[in-house]
């Protein structure tokens, strides 16, 4: 933005500048150009020897300017366009200035003036240029500063040129008031802080309903000496409940919301929320729908899931595999987990109680993501009821629970766990174990073994203890071994078939 302090052309000859010597040299003339009157200060004493003609402006109030720009529009006539030339003719003039705190009026003293520059035309008007208004207009600009006094004068010294001064415009530059990144920057005088710091740093203020983002930098701009804004730093963002519309922050419309200061527009209220009012920062959930603490406000409100589907309990000796499928209604969430609880009942007394402490789960039963789990260490001749509950992120916000139950009766003991204790070239020492709670029900253990690959014959040994040594075996041979508990009711669950190998005659024991 240019703030004009003096504009000769705009004043239509009314300024009345001082000429020195009075009545000689510079002369105010009116001409017609393109049917319009134009005023100019002109001098053409090219045949009059050495010249020292001064033209001084009126006193110009400096206002806030620190450096001023002087734009001159002028015409200089070619010295060769005069008959026979003109020996004392020049084609330049000098520009001066003087600062003062008061207007000296007609008191003109050359010594108070400081030379700014010699003004030379880029183009001179030669005689062939006179046709069709082809008068070469030169534009020159000079900068002066820093200024410190209340005002100043400019002066033009003619040293024998044929020159017409058509326009003298003096202005200073301001960076205009500006809205940028939702920040308002005030009109600022364009001034260099120093030679090394040619930019003035200006802090902006956020527009209504805009804020500096948390942890962010406040808005700053740099005003150059040329009156241009440069290098924006930081920004303002529309606060919660408001969105950016052009250079302002506007309240979110009803049915929309914005939860935080951001560049984002207002969002439509998500599913299962009540319509918001103007300027809403969130949308309330419908009755029966909830938001988990970690749910973003842009997410639909959700509800707890329904119970798992198709729960089955498959007994395998003293183990049960529980399987189920996901709930029909997830409540609109993906974060479903399952909890398994266990209850055991004694058939004789009908007495029941929790059994979490006495059974073992294949994985922790309270945050299952898969839809199956194996429960082991179940006691024979006991009735078990398993409840599988489906939960999601909002289940904790309601008291009701969504679960399905399955019951199973355990008749068999759990299969023994078998291991090889020792071996030699002709023998294998085998031990096993079963849960302590089931041991009282076992009458004997039956050990079946045979050579691997020999499907036609096998041997059986019975014992009441938890170990047996199988003798008269062939060296370096693999045997298939299985242990089965025998109860009063018949055979219990058999162990899996193990492969054990005797030592070779070259090998030593172990």
């Amino acid at each position: 933005k240019e703030v004009v302090l003096l504009d000769f052309a705009a004043m239509k000859g009314e300024l009345g500048w001082l000429t020195h010597p009075y009545g000689k040299g510079w002369d105010l003339m009116q001409n017609i150009m393109d049917d319009m009157p134009i005023y100019m200060y002109s001098v053409c004493n090219v045949v009059s020897g050495d010249q020292d003609n001064w033209l001084r402006t009126n006193w110009v109030y400096r206002e806030e300017a620190e450096r001023i720009f002087i734009e001159l529009k002028f015409t200089v006539r070619d010295c060769n366009s005069f008959p026979g030339g003109a020996s004392s003719c020049k084609e330049t003039f000098n520009l001066y200035y003087a600062e003062s705190d008061v207007d000296y009026g007609t008191n003109f003293q050359k010594r108070q003036f400081t030379k700014i520059d010699t003004i030379a035309p880029d183009e001179i008007t030669v005689s062939s240029d006179f046709e069709a208004r082809n008068v070469k207009l030169n534009v020159e600009e000079r900068m002066v500063g820093p200024l410190t006094r209340k005002g100043f004068y400019l002066a033009f010294q003619d040293i024998g040129a044929c020159v017409a001064l058509l326009s003298v415009r003096v202005y200073y530059k301001k960076c205009p008031e500006m809205l940028q990144s939702l920040a308002r920057f005030p009109e600022t005088i364009a001034v260099a802080v120093s030679d090394t710091q040619p930019l003035a740093t200006v802090a902006g203020t956020c527009v209504d309903h805009a804020v500096v983002p948390y942890g962010g930098e406040g808005p700053l701009m740099h005003c150059t000496v040329d009156g241009e804004w440069l290098v924006p730093i930081g920004q303002c963002l529309c606060q919660e409940g408001y969105e950016k519309v052009e250079d302002a922050c506007r309240a979110c419309s009803p049915g929309f919301f914005k939860s935080e200061a951001s560049e984002s527009p207002c969002l439509e209220c998500p599913e299962h929320t009540l319509p918001s009012t103007e300027g809403a920062t969130s949308c309330q959930c419908e009755e029966g729908y909830f938001r988990a603490p970690e749910d973003p406000l842009s997410m639909s409100c959700t509800r707890p899931p329904s119970a798992p589907n198709y729960l089955t309990a498959i007994g395998m000796g003293a183990k049960v595999e529980l399987r189920w499928t996901a709930p029909k209604d997830t409540g609109g969430r993906q974060d479903i987990v399952y909890s398994v609880t266990c209850e055991q009942c004694w058939p004789e007394s009908g007495e029941c109680g929790p059994c979490e402490a006495s059974v073992r789960y294949s994985e922790p039963p309270h945050a299952l993501t898969r839809t199956s789990v194996t429960v082991s260490d179940l006691e024979p001749h006991m009735n078990y009821t398993f409840a599988v509950e489906a939960r999601n992120g909002v289940s904790g916000l309601v008291t009701s629970r969504s679960f399905r139950t399955a019951s199973v009766s355990i008749n068999q003991t759990e299969p023994p766990k078998v291991r090889l204790e020792d071996r030699s070239t002709t023998s294998l020492s085998v031990t096993w174990s079963i849960p302590v709670s089931q041991q009282s029900r076992v009458w004997k253990y039956e050990v079946t073994y045979r050579k691997k690959g020999d499907a036609n014959s096998y041997n059986v040994r019975r014992t009441e203890g938890f170990s047996v040594t199988l003798d008269d075996l062939a060296p370096d041979t693999t045997y298939l071994v299985q242990v089965q508990a025998l109860t009063q009711e018949g055979q219990g669950a058999g162990s899996k078939v193990h492969e054990f190998q005797t030592l070779s005659t070259e090998g030593s024991a172990n």
Epitope: K24, G49, S87, S127, C162
Partner: antibody
């Protein structure tokens, strides 16, 4: 006020010389060039040239070189036109005129009353 | 040398009428040549010079225009004192006059 004063009519014989004075008043004589213009009886104007009153340097138009001389006496603010070897066709009114120079063009803004020079045997 | 041709040689007008005088150059010359008025027995008088600048004391019914080779002096409403001979003059390194146009009472 600004004035250019010329001498009265002159009658000369062919081959003779004449010196026509032009005395300036009302302004600084050396600040403006002086032109000379000839007007033959019943004819139009002819520009003869000018003299730089500051340096005394003359400029002659085509057809006015040789017999025509412009000169000055700045002490009495007077310009002179001297014509030698007069011919019958030199019979005319001779005007001095102050030159007005501007960036946008030139003119002669103050004229003497003219001096009639008659060349006749 | 540039030749200036003025037309018409004689222009008959009644007082109060508009008079238009033409000045044509043999080649492009200075814009808006100078114009002079000469009455019988008198020295010429400068009317207009430069960019159509009227000389001191010249009434505004006199105006000049034109460019290149064709120039015009216009007297918007001829007054009795305007009947005279009018000359155009081009400037530059050499000056020349037109042969003149006589404005007479119709």
């Amino acid at each position: 006020q600004v004035q250019l004063l010329q001498s009265g009519a002159e009658v000369k014989k062919p081959g003779a010389s004449v010196k026509v004075p032009c005395k300036a008043s009302g302004y600084t004589f050396t600040s403006r060039a002086m032109s000379w213009v000839r007007q033959a009886p019943g004819q139009g104007l002819e520009w003869m040239g000018w003299i730089n009153t500051n340096t005394g340097n003359p400029t002659y138009a085509q057809g006015f070189t040789g017999r025509f001389v412009f000169s000055l006496d700045t002490s009495v603010s007077t310009a002179y036109l001297q014509i030698s070897s007069l011919k019958a066709e030199d019979t005319a009114v001779y005007y001095c005129a102050r030159v007005r120079l501007t960036v946008y063009g030139d003119g002669m803004d103050v004229w003497g009353q003219g001096t009639l020079v008659t060349v006749s045997s | 040398e540039i030749v200036l041709t003025q037309s018409p040689a004689t222009l008959s007008v009644s007082p109060g009428e508009r008079a238009t005088l033409s000045c044509r150059a043999s080649q492009s010359v200075s814009s808006n040549p100078a114009w002079y008025q000469q009455k019988p027995g008198q020295a010429p008088r400068l009317l207009i010079y430069g960019l159509s600048t009227r000389a001191t004391g010249i009434p505004d019914r006199f105006s000049a225009s034109g460019s290149g080779t064709d120039f015009t002096l216009t007297i918007s409403r001829v007054e009795p004192e305007d009947f005279a001979v009018y000359y155009c003059q081009q400037y530059g390194p050499s000056w020349t006059f037109g042969q003149g146009t006589k404005v007479e009472i119709k």
